[in-house]
Amino acid sequence: LQDPCSNCPAGTFCDNNRNQICSPCPPNSFSSAGGQRTCDICRQCKGVFRTRKECSSTSNAECDCTPGFHCLGAGCSMCEQDCKQGQELTKKGCKDCCFGTFNDQKRGICRPWTNCSLDGKSVLVNGTKERDVVCGPSPADLSPGASSVTPPAPAREPGHSPQ
């Protein structure tokens, strides 16, 4: 025999207390699939959370974060404070990146500058708290006969003329 509850569409629940009729989900609750025996309580976007999408009888509310915060976790389960670029969030609040590290976003941690010499390259633009270093061509790339890459004038090394 077919379960009578399977006929209950999204937005309703199979009410066992009332001969398994399909009762509409009460306000502030929803069922996103058919055949459900209860409706789920709608998520409330309160405090630092704000409503991105309202709840309906067939779908849960979706939250994001108020300005100055950003989402973390599946479905924006948490809101974390933004910091400025060049900072990272610590237990004591936003702190500037230490020398040799940078953060170009309002979230996340400070990461070490790229070590250009590991790739045999030179530093083209120095790093800052907000930006990574820019690695230039390797010294070999700048020798006569190499492919015609024209490095910016300020980065020219002594004794090398533009190709």
Partner: antibody, heavy 122, light 109 residues
Amino acid sequence: EVQLVESGGGLVQPGGSLRLSCAASGFSFSANYYPCWVRQAPGKCLEWIGCIYGGSSDITYDAQWTKGRFTISRDNSKNTVYLQMNSLRAEDTAVYYCARSAWYSGWGGDLWGQGTLVTVSS
Amino acid sequence: IQMTQSPSSLSASVGDRVTITCQASQSISNRLAWYQQKPGKAPKLLIYSGGTLASGVPSRFSGSGSGTDFTLTISSLQPEDFATYYCQSTYYGNDGNAFGCGTKVTVLG
């Protein structure tokens, strides 16, 4: 403009049939909005007839007294709901209202049509 | 579900506090709506979920109650409030959405 407009009322003889229509504009019936029918005999109380699920399922909720005589149906492509009334009696004479029962308003009737008068008389 | 409203009519003056009661034949939790109807017009939703004011309804209207006993209160009656008031169960199901038979509020004197 968000509105409900009923049509199809008029004079009908006892034992006859009538089909009322309720056209929705400015919104669509859905799982959040159920179309319902309510009637009011002259000088009498409001009387609930029934509602139909607003989405694609044909689940209806009806007052027991309507069984076998009144049927609610819906055409989603036309965003219209119907009330088929058979074996009409003098006591069915009333203004028939179409109403929107909304999840957002605790399933209260937050939007009503202007009503259409049905007179059952020989 | 049967809904019993009382009184069936009452007379009051502008500024009066008016209370109308509605009783359900079985528990309907907070699933109750109140409507106002004026002659020749369709009903207008005032309150839903027992005590939530519908959009655009003045704050002098309030609703309370849960289970089987509910109350509509008009804190200070205004000239435009003379009308008939209905309660309705919104506890969906067959026969679940019955109306009370109304309370007519008329001018005293």
